[in-house]
């Protein structure tokens, strides 16, 4: 498939309260793991079903999450992201981006990554 | 044809109660949550939301321990009680619903209108 493919990028302020397995999502990247390539940002590899990212409906994998609670996340090794998130408190915000493919295009594999807390 | 009917929604004192049904028809649902409007240019944001099958539920912390969301599968109609209602609650509050386990609700039903005086 040579086609073009475009995307919309629209950015977000969720606000999430942990549930009883947490925020119900998986991270992956960092700057010792970058999951894009020339980009050490941190993003949703997975959603938990029945989880508390699920049940809200906002956060989607594939989403890059900017900031937690106003904390940046650039240039952050991705243990580091994991334990932001995992001391990030009862109610949580995310600011995150969501990139919508607006042509079909072939789908990456995405790993599991790591839970958020 | 999908079909997501509200009702129970009315005026009442602050520190009073409501309960809201919301009755499903033409499909089995894997998650519903209950969404409020407190003003038409304000977005919806999700208060509470529940699993179908596992019944696993979510609420967003400014109504954690007030509202309980409840399901019954016979009925095919999911409940919120809402409780210790105070005047920030008034708004219009949405049913929806998903097929999917994640991502966002796909059905809407067109809401009621709670008022706490």
């Known amino acids: 498939m040579n086609g073009r493919v475009d995307y919309l990028v629209t950015e977000e302020e969720i606000n999430l309260t942990r549930g009883p397995s947490g925020l119900g999502f998986n991270i992956v990247g960092g700057t010792d793991q970058q999951y894009v390539s020339n980009d050490s940002g941190i993003y949703v590899s997975r959603i938990k079903e029945n989880g508390a990212a699920a049940l809200d409906g906002r956060l989607q994998e594939g989403d890059k999450i900017l900031s937690v609670n106003g904390q940046d996340l650039k240039n952050l090794l991705h243990q580091d992201a994991v334990d932001l998130f995992r001391n990030a408190g009862y109610a949580v915000s995310l600011r995150v981006q969501h990139r919508l493919q607006v042509q079909n295009g072939p789908i990456g594999h995405r790993g599991e990554g790591d839970p958020s807390g | 044809e999908v079909q997501l009917v509200e009702s129970g929604g009315g005026l009442v004192q602050a520190g009073g109660s409501l309960r809201l049904s919301c009755a499903a028809s033409?499909?089995?649902?894997?998650?519903v949550g209950w969404f409020h409007q407190p003003a038409p240019e304000k977005r919806r944001e999700v208060v509470a939301?529940?699993?179908?099958?596992?019944?696993?539920?979510y609420y967003t912390h400014f109504v954690e321990g007030r509202f309980t969301i409840s399901r019954d599968n016979a009925k095919n109609t999911v409940y919120l009680q809402m409780n210790s209602l105070t005047p920030e609650d008034t708004a219009v509050y949405y049913c929806?619903?998903?097929?999917?386990?994640?991502?966002?609700?796909?059905?809407w039903g067109q809401g009621t209108q709670v008022t706490v005086s």
């Open positions: 939301a529940i699993s179908w099958r596992s019944g696993d539920t």
């Open positions: 929806a619903a998903s097929d999917k386990s994640t991502g966002p609700y796909e059905y």
């Open positions: 033409g499909r089995t649902f894997s998650r």
